[in-house]
């Protein structure tokens, strides 16, 4: 049974030519995370294995950073990178946990972060 | 190129432990980032993924066989190990040791990439 | 554990035709799906990774393609040594799981 929940930062934005860390965190479950995939809008951004490391998707090497943890760092951000980001969890044994994120990236210095919020 | 080879007898009697050996060439286990996997076949079946471990000693099993397994690494040989206990005429298979994830960091996928050969158990008195 | 089912169990189609093979998740794999072949008293082989990328020396009448829980393996024109068992597998969620095998035959 999945009792887990998955913890995100929900609404957020950011400045055109700035960064943002994405995260997610999964609480109220033992279950073991063995990886992370990072997709945008079935785009994938970037994998995190447990065992076998980061994979950086090529065609966001140079956006896209690993970590901190197991979250994700988008660099010189676009007004195209504004959309919906999901954080896979992968674990055993429970199986698949998804949280999303949606990420507004403006063109003035007035981005604020939005608040949490959970996903089941 | 990685390759593998798995060793081990062809008979075994039931209620008894099944172990096989399999070893690795063309690369160190213990720098590879990589899952060593076991797979089995019974005779006209499909495949059945066993279980797997990670260099560091992390290990996967399938929960159906998850009370009877043991996968083991020995970095020093260049070789990992499966155990199965307790035998039955439905342990009979093709045994395949297996490389999974080997292009992980490159392109980002977790699959069997590089199979052994295989070798016949038959658990029979 | 995610349950794969592929379908049909055989298949039989004539050398130069186009083969297709289905395989379905019991929940979504997102595009983290793997198709092998095998041949009699062989190992599977890996032809295709990411529900749609080739592997490695895999000619390009292997085609793959589906997201989610549906996904199909196409063979656009069936050579004499494509006559073979082959599997879907998903992961990375542990317990990796198989499909049953669709056996393409000769018609």
């Known amino acids: 049974m999945m009792t887990g929940t998955i913890e995100t930062t929900g609404n957020i934005s950011a400045e055109k030519g700035g960064s943002i860390i994405l995260q997610c965190h999964l609480s109220s479950t033992t279950a073991q995370v063995t990886q992370v995939n990072w997709e945008q809008q079935d785009q994938l951004l970037a994998i995190c294995n447990a065992d076998l490391g980061w994979h950086i998707s090529p065609s966001f090497k140079d956006r896209v950073a690993p970590g901190p943890g197991l979250g994700l760092t988008l660099q010189s951000l676009t007004v195209n990178d504004t959309g919906e980001y999901f954080c896979i969890y992968h674990t055993y044994p429970d199986g698949t946990y998804t949280g999303r994120i949606f990420l507004e990236v403006l063109e003035s210095s007035v981005a604020e972060h939005g608040a949490r919020f959970q996903i089941p | 190129q990685l390759q593998l080879q798995e060793s081990g007898p062809g008979l075994v009697k039931p209620s008894e432990t099944l172990s096989l050996t399999c070893t690795v060439s063309g690369g160190s286990i213990s720098s590879g980032s990589y899952y060593l996997a076991w797979i089995r076949q019974p005779p006209g079946k499909g495949l059945e993924w066993i279980g797997s471990i990670f260099r560091s000693g992390s290990t996967y099993y399938n929960p159906s066989l998850e009370s009877r397994v043991t996968i083991s690494v020995d970095t020093s040989k260049n070789q990992f190990s499966l155990k199965l206990s307790s035998v039955t005429a439905a342990d009979t298979a093709v045994y395949y040791c297996?490389?999974?994830?080997?292009?992980?960091?490159?392109?980002?996928?977790?699959?069997?990439?590089?199979w052994g050969q295989g070798t016949t158990v038959t658990v029979s008195s | 554990e995610i349950v794969m089912t592929q379908s049909p169990a055989t298949l039989s189609v004539s050398p130069g035709e186009r083969a297709t093979l289905s395989c379905r998740a019991s929940?979504?794999?997102?595009?983290?799906l793997a198709w092998y072949q095998q041949k009699p008293g062989q190992a599977p082989r890996l032809l295709i990774y990411g529900a749609s990328t080739r592997a490695t020396g895999i000619p390009a009448r292997f085609s793959g393609s589906g997201s989610g829980t549906e996904f199909t393996l196409t063979i656009s024109s069936l050579q004499s040594e494509d006559f073979a068992v082959y599997y879907c597998?998903?992961?990375?969620?542990?317990?990796?799981?198989f499909g049953g095998g669709t056996k393409v035959e000769i018609k």
């Open positions: 297996a490389i999974e994830g080997a292009n992980f960091k490159d392109f980002g996928y977790v699959a069997f990439d590089i």
């Open positions: 929940q979504s794999v997102s595009s983290n």
């Open positions: 597998q998903q992961s990375p969620p542990w317990p990796r799981t």
